[in-house]
């Protein structure tokens, strides 16, 4: 596991404890909460980040209408169970034995049940729609410049391969970033779109997960891009299973 050798820290995850007790005395960083060793050369999985957080304190000019199956994370924070690779376990339960199934980004995709609830597989979230509203500016941003800046951000800051940023839509003041990544497209070593979206969400909220880096300073042609509202929609490879009662509520 790589980490900055000189002072043994994890550049990509401040929610770690690092010590020179890895193989050969190399720096090894463990995520708070889980104690799992993390690879500091890339993003840490959202599951481990949530666990750490709980332990510490189409048409270019048209906005996308989220699918009827799109999920929004309304449940907020919880202390998740992560598998040995740091991914969300398909079934999550709380202290009172209430259980539910989640997708690969940890968002609930079924009604809540008891310990008998079965979640056969971890369903992959293959499409993420990040919906932003920016603060008023003198004029609209140039769409091409905005597109280029956001793609650069995801490539350089979050190490997400450019092919997974499907589109950037803009109708002032709303910006939409579409991330797409099918199971078959994701190769070993590729950053997961769910992890990139989570790092971006925390950056936008001024809660950067990066060690020692300044907060996110988004600029388009020198003009600050200040976000005042964020909504993230998650679309799974298999539609979620909620009862009709919830769908009509």
């Amino acid at each position: 596991h790589t980490a900055a050798q000189d002072n043994c820290t994890c550049p990509t995850n401040k929610m770690t404890v690092c010590s020179p007790d890895g193989p050969g005395g190399r720096c090894q960083c463990r995520a708070l909460g889980s104690g799992m060793a993390v690879d500091c050369s890339t993003l840490t999985s959202k599951c481990l980040l949530l666990k750490a957080r709980m332990s510490a304190p189409k048409n270019a000019r048209t906005l996308v209408r989220p699918s009827e199956h799109a999920l929004v994370d309304n449940d907020g924070l919880y202390d998740p169970d992560c598998d040995p690779e740091g991914r969300f376990k398909a079934r999550q339960c709380n202290q009172t034995s209430v259980c539910w199934c989640v997708n690969s980004v940890g968002v609930r995709r079924t009604d809540k049940g008891d310990l008998s609830l079965r979640c056969d597989e971890l369903v992959r979230t293959h499409h993420i729609l990040i919906d932003l509203r920016h603060r008023p500016t003198a004029g609209a941003f140039n769409h091409s410049d905005l597109d280029a800046e956001l793609r650069r951000l995801f490539r350089e800051r979050y190490r997400l391969h450019p092919k997974f940023v499907a589109a950037v839509h803009y109708e002032q003041p709303t910006i939409q970033i579409e991330l797409r990544q099918n199971t078959s497209q994701k190769a070993a070593g590729d950053v997961d779109i769910g992890d990139a979206a989570y790092y971006f969400e925390r950056d936008i909220k001024g809660e950067s997960l990066f060690q020692g880096r300044g907060g996110l300073d988004l600029r388009v042609r020198g003009e600050p891009l200040q976000v005042e509202r964020t909504l993230i929609y998650y679309l799974d490879e298999i539609p979620p299973k909620f009862s009709m009662k919830r769908l009509t509520a």
């Epitope: 010590s19 007790d21 193989p23 050969g24 104690g35 060793a37 598998d83």
Partner: antibody
Framework: EVQLVQSGAEVKKPGASVKVSCKAS????????INWVRQAPGQGLEWMGN????????NYNQKFKDRVTMTRDTSTSTVYMELSSLRSEDTAVYYC??????????WGQGTLVTVSS | EIVLTQSPATLSLSPGERATLSCRAS??????IAWYQQKPGQAPRLLIE???ESISGIPARFSGSGSGTDFTLTISSLEPEDFAVYYC?????????FGGGTKVEIK
């Protein structure tokens, strides 16, 4: 030479607390985790938790979470493990251990804590 | 938590024989396993780390193998001082856990 020297044996009454110390020498105290492991008579090893002396970050085994407190004093390179609300089943040898790589490479000599009325 | 199951509980062998001890994890832990030897009245002694990496000062007759969920400690030829209890321990995630131990006794 790396050494972990623990405090002496203790006899306590049920409901009392015990505080065991572990003094480290021969390495950079703040750079390595210190773990606490206990072993009841004739039983196996049980991990209680650990502390990272550099910043006092602690992590406890859920089983002991409400009763155990681990602290450190960097000026004396000493780590402490306090266990409260003692019961007879807490009778055991308590070891401190310095964590290296994937294993607990260095161990204290052990401290026998006997809980008896 | 990750449960480690060691087998057999007791292994009766003669000096010079080969000892094979098994440790099975309840879930994939890669190679995050260590092996210890413990003699009566003594603290455990680290023998192997990262499933197969030997520790300096430990005799070459001790070797480890395995990854994922199945791990093995092998003592190629038992010496009289090797009769003891052996524990595996995982450090994949907290809480760190130990196996129940395998006692290697003289036949």
């Amino acid at each position: 030479e790396v050494q972990l020297v623990q405090s002496g044996a203790e006899v306590k009454k049920p409901g009392a607390s015990v505080k065991v110390s572990c003094k480290a020498s021969g390495y950079t105290f703040t750079s390595y985790w210190i773990n606490w492991v206990r072993q009841a008579p004739g039983q196996g090893l049980e991990w209680m938790g650990n502390i990272y002396p550099s910043n006092s970050y602690t992590n406890y085994n859920q089983k002991f979470k409400d009763r155990v407190t681990m602290t450190r004093d960097t000026s004396t390179s000493t780590v402490y493990m306090e266990l409260s609300s003692l019961r007879s089943e807490d009778t055991a040898v308590y070891y401190c251990s310095s964590y290296r790589s994937d294993g607990f490479a260095y161990w204290g000599q052990g401290t026998l804590v006997t809980v008896s009325s | 938590e990750i449960v480690l199951t060691q087998s057999p509980a007791t292994l009766s062998l003669s000096p010079g024989e080969r000892a094979t001890l098994s440790c099975r994890a309840s879930q994939n832990i890669g190679t995050s396993i260590a092996w210890y030897q413990q003699k009566p009245g003594q603290a455990p002694r680290l023998l192997i780390e990262f499933a197969s990496e030997s520790i300096s000062g430990i005799p070459a007759r001790f070797s480890g193998s395995g990854s994922g969920t199945d791990f093995t400690l092998t003592i190629s030829s038992l010496e009289p001082e090797d009769f003891a209890v052996y524990y595996c321990q995982q450090s994949n995630s907290w809480p760190f856990t130990f196996g129940g131990g395998t006692k290697v006794e003289i036949k």
